[in-house]
């Protein structure tokens, strides 16, 4: 079964979203797995479905179970599960390990830490943040965005970091908060303008007709963990997101590798059944940190 | 190269069973639904199983209960095991590459050569 | 289940004149994303099928622009502008709205 773990704490708004895919056109139903009692999508019910997304607005312990999401994609419907335990409020500040989301690890050079299911909510910054249930006051903490930066991080700095913000729905407010633990890494590092190892600047790279091809975007920033560094590919100028191909995809997650003790990241861009058309794209191959950008540019040709 | 290889077709009496089997190269194959089409001789083409990439399966109601399809990621491979065989099953199956990635549809475009399976006493 | 019917059962063809292959389906097979779910498939003598068409009017990688898919709804022409002598075989349309079903075919030969 095809199924994804969600939690949430009594009283604040939980959204889950389908563990399966589907273009946003596709109709989604969702039903209580147990009873198969449909969801509704009317939005004055405190439980309702909306496309891919059920809410619990607020959640309540008795809510807790498994969730069915058949989502009406053509050829065959596809089935997800999701397991829904909402938990009742802590009276003291200690939040237990079910309610965790992953740990995060940042350096004097790094320190991002990402409010965990945000990007799911109607929400409006700023984002409170708490560590050990102490809102974090100071010069050194930054809320920006979805995410909290900590300047000048000491091995103190570790612990468990919550974030709160209000979800809207129509009007009304809804608290949610998420926690992950933050831990430090001790580490002397420096950082330099992004040098690509790979693609070589206008590369041209043979690839058959009908079969796969990969493209791996490689480049060095620095030594240590290095502070907003990324990779990335780019078509005609497009990011892949908005390119609209579906066939090109970037690999999911920048693979991070040490090369002679310098911190570097790869990107793979994925073409899958390679067409004629492809041949006539420009491939960007973007490395980025806060020293600037160096882009190097890729061409597809037909193997002989 | 792109391909899809069956194997395990051949002759059974009516009520038997018979393991098929697909070998797929040339392409990510976790990323992409499965399907068994069916072929009698002289006649047209008929799809009997689908697995999609989470292990889903589904079938049309002249094999439910009797066929199931199975995959295996790691070895590239998807499998077609069919029971109490009639002599209606008898035809070339074969094995084909469907839906990418959930929802994207570019058409059955990868199609193997078809292993024959005859059911006769 | 959706029926899909093709005519005719057999169209013999000329090298160099066009042809047309015509299939109806007993439903719709236009979806909310705005694809019509229907494929064309040619089966030459002794092979496995090919895919020439996806949804209504896609050419599929390597086929030749002589071949054209058309329609929308439930009624979907399959044209080839100029008959070559290699495009003789069994064509097929195939629905992908609600599982897979096929055509009769249509058998095209040289007159």
């Known amino acids: 079964k095809f199924s994804k773990q969600s939690w949430g704490l009594e009283n604040e708004a939980l959204i889950v979203r389908c563990p399966r895919q589907g273009k946003p056109s596709y109709t989604v139903d969702w039903y209580y797995s147990q009873t198969n009692k449909s969801i509704p999508t009317q939005e004055r019910n405190r439980v309702f479905a909306s496309g891919q997304l059920l809410k619990f607005l607020p959640a309540e312990v008795a809510d807790s179970g498994i969730y069915t999401c058949i989502v009406r994609s053509p050829t065959f419907n596809r089935t997800g599960y999701a397991n829904v335990t909402i938990y009742k409020k802590q009276s003291d500040c200690n939040v237990p390990d079910y309610l965790m989301y992953s740990t995060v690890s940042g350096s004097e050079k790094n320190s991002k830490i990402y409010c965990p299911t945000i990007d799911l909510y109607n929400w409006t910054a700023p984002l409170e943040w708490f560590k050990n249930c102490q809102a974090l006051q100071g010069s050194r903490y930054r809320a920006h965005k979805s995410f909290l930066v900590i300047d000048n991080v000491m091995t103190e700095d570790a612990g468990d970091y919550t974030c709160k913000f209000i979800h809207n729905e129509n009007g009304a407010n809804y608290s949610v908060t998420a926690t992950r633990s933050f831990t430090v890494k001790d580490e002397q590092g420096f950082s330099l303008f992004p040098v690509i190892g790979a693609p070589a600047q206008n590369e041209i790279k043979e690839v058959e007709i009908g079969k796969n091809a990969n493209l791996t975007c490689s480049a060095c920033f620095g030594k240590g963990t290095q502070f907003l560094a990324a990779v990335l590919w780019q078509l005609n100028g497009t990011k892949i997101t908005d390119f609209g191909e579906p066939r090109i995809q970037q690999e999911e997650g920048q693979n991070q590798s040490f090369s002679n003790g310098l911190a570097c990241l790869d990107m793979v861009l994925r073409i899958a059944d390679v067409k004629e058309e492809d041949l006539l794209l420009q491939y960007d191959c973007l490395a980025l940190n806060l020293h600037g950008l160096r882009r190097h540019t890729v061409r597809l040709s037909r193997k002989n | 190269e792109v391909q899809l290889v069956e194997s395990g077709g051949g002759w059974v009496q009516p009520g038997g069973s018979l393991r098929l089997s697909c070998a797929a190269s040339?392409?990510?194959?976790?990323?992409?639904?499965m399907y068994w089409v069916r072929q009698a001789t002289g006649k047209g083409l008929e799809w009997v199983s689908g697995?999609?990439?989470?292990?889903?399966?589904y079938y049309p109601d002249s094999v439910k209960g009797r066929f199931t399809i199975s995959r295996e990621n790691a070895k590239n491979s998807v499998y077609l095991q069919m029971n109490t065989l009639r002599a209606g099953d008898t035809a070339v199956y074969y094995c084909v590459r469907g839906i990418y990635g959930d929802f994207y549809y570019y058409g059955l475009d990868v199609w193997g050569h078809g292993t024959t399976v005859t059911v006769s006493s | 289940d959706i029926v899909m019917t093709q005519s005719p059962l057999s169209l013999p063809v000329t090298p160099g004149e066009p042809a047309s292959i015509s299939c109806r389906s007993s439903?719709?097979?236009?979806?909310?994303?705005?694809?019509?779910?229907l494929d064309w498939y040619l089966q030459k003598p002794g092979q496995s099928p090919h895919l020439l068409i996806y949804?209504?009017?896609n050419r599929a990688s390597g086929v030749p622009d002589r071949f054209s898919g058309s329609g929308s709804g439930t009624d979907f022409t399959l044209k080839i502008s100029r008959v070559e002598a290699d495009d003789v075989g069994v064509y097929y349309c195939m629905q992908a709205l609600q599982t897979l079903t096929f055509g009769g075919g249509t058998k095209v030969e040289i007159k």
């Open positions: 439903q719709s097979l236009l979806y909310s994303d705005g694809n019509n779910y």
């Open positions: 697995i999609d990439t989470v292990g889903d399966t």
């Open positions: 040339g392409f990510t194959f976790s990323s992409y639904d």
């Open positions: 949804l209504g009017s």
